[in-house]
Interface confidence: low
């Protein structure tokens, strides 16, 4: 006997018990593929979620996060609280980035400043909580005849030879590197992983009506202790 259910299009379900009739999905449900034997319940965007795309008979609703939160996970399965630039989200809320780290976004964790000396470069612009350092030219770029894509070095004062400039640049780079290393070595930067505000897709809601009776949410926090920024 031919399986007539395979002829049922998306947006319907195949009712085996009624001579395999293709019936439309009930309200607040969908089937995204043909031949389904039942329709899936629609996702409801409640709580910290807002609707980006309404549910239709052939596709599930799509959610975004309300203002002050951003999406995480596949299909925006969770919402995480926004912080300001220069901050990261910890167990205790938004905290300023520790010295030597920065975050230029409203999400994510503080990242260490770039270590210019690892590339043989010098620090042209100091880093802040919101911005990474800007690396300047390497000492080799300061010697005559060298070509570089980095910004040109400031005009030299008359009377100073390239050798002296090279020596000063090298010394300052080493000193900066040592300072940077010491700061990182002795600062206690225990960065918490993200505090995720998990909002599960739907607790119990109406399969037939479009309103939801209650929101289900679960807040899970990292177990590790919160670190400070003391030196």
């Amino acid at each position: 006997l031919q399986d007539l259910c395979s002829n049922c299009p998306a947006g319907t379900f195949c009712d085996n018990n009624r001579s395999q009739i293709c019936s439309p999905c009930p309200p607040n449900s969908f089937s995204s593929a043909g031949g389904q034997r039942t329709c899936d319940i629609c996702r409801q965007c409640k709580g910290v979620f807002k609707t980006r795309k309404e549910c239709s008979s052939t596709s599930n609703a799509e959610c975004d996060c309300i203002s002050g939160y951003h999406c995480l996970g596949a299909e925006c399965s969770m919402c995480e609280q926004d912080c300001k630039q220069g901050q990261e989200l910890t167990k205790k809320g938004c905290k300023d980035c520790c010295f030597g780290t920065f975050n230029d976004q409203k999400r994510g964790i503080c990242r260490p400043w770039t270590n210019c000396s690892l590339d043989g470069k010098s620090v042209l612009v100091n880093g802040t909580k919101e911005r990474d350092v800007v690396c300047g030219p390497s000492p080799a770029d300061l010697s005559p005849g060298a070509s570089s894509a980095t910004p040109p070095a400031p005009a030299r004062e008359p009377g100073h030879s390239p050798q002296i400039i090279f020596f000063l640049a090298l010394t300052s780079t080493v000193v900066l590197f040592l300072l940077f290393f010491l700061v990182l070595r002795f600062s206690v930067v225990k960065r918490s992983r993200k505090k995720l505000l998990y909002i599960f897709k739907q607790p119990f809601m109406r399969p037939v009506q479009t309103t939801q009776e209650e929101d289900g949410c679960s807040c899970r926090f990292p177990e590790e202790e919160e670190g400070g920024c003391e030196l």
Epitope: S23, Q36, T38, C39, N60
Partner: antibody
Framework: QVQLQESGPGLVKPSETLSITCTVS????????VHWVRQPPGKGLEGLGV???????NYNSALMSRLTISKDNSKSQVSLKMSSLTAADTAMYYC???????????WGQGTTVTVSS | DIQMTQSPSSLSASLGDRVTISCSAS??????LNWYQQKPDGTVKLLIY???TLHSGVPSRFSGSGSGTDFTLTISSLQPEDVATYYC?????????FGGGTKLEIK
């Protein structure tokens, strides 16, 4: 022929977690939902929760904090986990296939769970 | 949650009798109601879905009616194999809830 078969531990101690599996044969979990129902001795049926073809779940609001329903489509198995058991959770546990406009057209035979120390 | 109330909780009837079981919902559920039969050995079977649609393989002596909040399961001529407990179940709103059951015996 579609069949659902529950398998569970039988006896569980209070405060422990119950784990029951429903094995489905002759039917695809990507086309049908599976609902869990329990029946305490001498009492009526109580719906626990459902897992839909797409994998999303709904739980009985009174038990939501203790329940987890998941599935493995490749093994045709649906599992129910219930934590923090008490004597009140002693019951016959059934799984049933959800089809059409959400009726349970095929039921398992049920598995008896006794919560006792 | 929607409360489902069945009456009577038990009844005894003679073979060939017409039997009716009532089910009442605490709020309107349109026609989103199913009926199930649980035999003494614990086996559960679907009888009727969407208030009045007979499930495949169910004898025609079973029928269902009603709408909104009041529903009825009718057995037109009671047979020995009908000894069981009957449950109504709404699916208008999750959580899907069952009535308390009606135990049917033969006199």
């Amino acid at each position: 022929q579609v069949q659902l078969q529950e398998s569970g531990p039988g006896l569980v101690k209070p405060s422990e977690t119950l784990s029951i599996t429903c094995t489905v044969s002759g039917s695809s979990l990507t086309s049908y939902g599976v609902h869990w129902v329990r029946q305490p001795p001498g009492k009526g049926l109580e719906g626990l929760g459902v897992i839909w073809p797409g994998g999303s779940t709904n739980y009985n609001s009174a038990l939501m904090s203790r329940l987890t329903i998941s599935k493995d489509n490749s093994k045709s198995q649906v599992s129910l986990k219930m934590s923090s058991l008490t004597a009140a959770d002693t019951a016959m546990y059934y799984c049933a296939r959800v089809t059409g406009t959400w009726y349970f057209d095929v039921w398992g035979q049920g598995t008896t769970v006794t919560v006792s120390s | 949650d929607i409360q489902m109330t069945q009456s009577p909780s038990s009844l005894s009837a003679s073979l060939g009798d017409r039997v009716t079981i009532s089910c009442s919902a605490s709020q309107g559920i349109s026609n989103y109601l199913n009926w199930y039969q649980q035999k003494p050995d614990g086996t559960v079977k679907l009888l009727i879905y969407y208030t009045s649609t007979l499930h495949s393989g169910v004898p025609s002596r079973f029928s269902g009616s009603g709408s909104g909040t009041d529903f009825t399961l009718t057995i037109s001529s009671l047979q020995p194999e009908d000894v069981a407990t009957y449950y109504c179940q709404q699916y208008s709103k999750l959580p899907w809830t069952f009535g308390g059951g009606t135990k049917l015996e033969i006199k």
